[in-house]
């Protein structure tokens, strides 16, 4: 913590300006009035401050506003934001998205990916739901900040905001967001044309169930292997042989190159090596001829 | 434009351990495994191992087992390889290589980084 | 594994020459997945051909790849200055995947 001292007259600051660039750390903390520092916010970003400025201005600040700081300030706070923590951020109430905009675009090329996501979910919060212009402002100033977002607060998007989700927001998503966002985008794009329908479906088929997914093999979507390899493992290990081919169509050459890698090498392992070789593709693994498959689990479930 | 930007040239002692970054970009990251490679002068090209950046689930030419760790970080579209106990059979340039899932060909190469290892 | 041996190891052509480049497997390839990589030196490795015979985007019609089973080639049918550079098979039928050991290609 800074040492307090008293300010000498001629330093008394009665604006913020360049010339505060010169004051000492301590002189700082001394002559810089925290009041007339949140009201004249918008000039600090213009300022050449050290870091170690900066350190002070923000204890200033929150002497200031213990229990948070209010929007006035936070929309002003520009590289000072760099030196929050998730902490202080988790503090804030956040509504507008001229704010959000312009700390994320502070935030840029700074390993921030903490503060921003805890900065987005006060947004949420503040805005009472996942609306479309968050969104927008959201894949325009932060691709992928999406799944920054906890499972519970991406259950408050619309479907009708789906549509504005572009394929490579949600490629850090993880199964359990994609489990809230695809019955969302189900829903969203219901009324599309078959083809059309898996184009848009295809970023969000990672939290499909199989029924969905058996759906699909009868449409003739021929899903690409990358696609098939974010499927949930759960949904493709009840998959039979015939329903992968015709889910794959000509990419099922694919399932070769990946039959080492899950979830293509545990669903090999639940199939029948017979079923397996009217592929020709030459997988292995698959359960021999003539061996029975007991599922223990339901037999103890019956018992 | 599609790129695979590698670290520049490491000098380590025997026995350390160097971890290499491969930061992609230009690409959906999660739509490409990332394999690695490493090129010697006496033994040419050789295939390291894979790791597919939706489920970190990797795949090791034996021969790498316990030399090689294949890591990814998806928010910062990077994968990592980390190579240890390391001795001058390890000198070598290391490439990392991008391959479409479903297919076995790199068709995007890194810049490669050069590993020497001497004392 | 599968060893692929490519021959010759070193060679060199005169202008609008014909070349090929050999690469034999120790066993069977699918020819669906077995490619060829262009390297200069000084930079990294490029892919040239895939699947045997599919020219990669931005070569020059004046390569081909043709081949089966355990032996695949790769054809310049006129030799250019920039064809120069070392040549590497490599196959992904089997794990490991494996690469030849090249052919450098010199200009005469």
């Known amino acids: 913590d800074v040492e307090r001292t008293t300010c000498p007259p001629e330093k008394e600051v009665h604006e913020i300006d360049e010339s505060l660039i010169f004051y000492k750390k301590r002189e700082l903390e001394a002559c810089v009035d925290a009041a007339l520092l949140a009201a004249q916010m918008d000039r600090v970003d213009a300022i050449p401050f050290t870091y170690e400025q900066l350190d002070v201005l923000k204890h200033k600040l929150d002497e200031l506003y213990p229990q948070g700081y209010p929007e006035s300030v936070i929309r002003h706070l520009g590289h000072l934001f760099l030196k929050m923590s998730p902490e202080d951020i988790r503090k804030w109430n956040v509504t507008s998205l001229e704010t959000l905009k312009a700390l994320l675009k502070v935030s840029k090329g700074h390993e921030m990916s903490a503060q921003v996501a805890t900065l987005i979910d006060r947004v949420v919060v503040g805005r009472g739901q996942l609306d479309k212009d968050t969104v927008d402002t959201l894949t325009a100033f932060c691709p992928g900040c999406l799944c920054s977002l906890s499972p519970e607060r991406l259950s408050s998007v619309p479907p009708s905001v789906i549509g504005a989700v572009r394929p490579q927001d949600l490629d850090t998503c993880g199964p359990r967001q994609l489990d809230v966002l695809y019955p969302k985008a189900r829903l969203a794009f219901q009324n599309m044309s078959g083809s059309e329908y898996f184009v848009k479906i295809r970023p969000f088929l990672g939290g499909a169930p199989t029924e969905d997914v058996k759906a699909l093999s009868q449409q003739n979507v021929s899903m690409d292997l990358a696609t098939f390899m974010k499927l949930r493992r759960e949904a493709v290990l009840p998959l039979t042989v015939a329903e992968v081919q015709k889910l794959l169509g000509p990419h099922v050459e694919g399932l070769k190159v990946e039959e080492q890698h899950s979830p293509v090498r545990d669903w090999i392992l639940k199939q029948r090596q017979d079923d397996l070789d009217t592929l020709g593709l030459g997988l292995q693994g698959g359960i021999p001829n003539g061996y029975l498959i007991l599922d223990l689990s339901v037999r103890e479930a019956l018992s | 434009e599609v790129q695979l930007q590698q670290s520049g040239p490491e000098l380590v002692k025997p026995g350390a351990s160097v971890k290499i970054p491969c930061k992609a970009s230009?690409?959906?990251?999660?739509?490409?495994?990332m394999d690695w490679v490493k090129q010697s002068h006496g033994k040419g090209l050789e295939w390291i191992g894979d790791i597919n950046p939706n489920t970190d689930d990797t795949i090791y030419n034996q021969k790498f087992n316990g030399k090689a760790t294949l890591t990814v970080d998806k928010s910062s579209s990077t994968a990592y390889m980390e190579l240890r106990s390391l001795t001058s059979e390890d000198t070598a340039v290391y490439y990392c290589?991008?391959?479409?899932?479903?297919?076995?060909?790199?068709?995007?190469w890194g810049t490669g980084t050069t590993v020497t290892v001497s004392s | 594994q599968i060893v692929l041996t490519q021959s010759p190891a070193i060679m060199s052509a005169s202008p609008g020459e014909k070349v090929t480049l050999t690469c034999s497997a120790s066993?069977?390839?699918?020819?669906?997945?077995l490619c060829w990589y262009r390297q200069k030196p000084g930079s990294s490795p490029e892919l040239w051909i895939y699947?045997?015979?599919n020219l990669a985007s931005g070569v020059p019609a004046r390569f081909s790849g043709s081949g089966s089973g355990t032996s695949y080639s790769l054809t310049i049918s006129s030799m250019e200055a920039e064809d120069a550079a070392s040549y590497f098979c490599?196959?992904?039928?089997?794990?490991?995947?494996?690469f030849g050991g090249g052919t450098k290609l010199g200009m005469k």
């Open positions: 490599h196959q992904w039928s089997n794990y490991p995947y494996t």
């Open positions: 290589s991008r391959r479409l899932i479903g297919t076995g060909y790199f068709d995007v």
């Open positions: 230009g690409y959906t990251f999660t739509d490409y495994n």
């Open positions: 699947s045997t015979s």
């Open positions: 066993s069977s390839v699918i020819s669906t997945y």
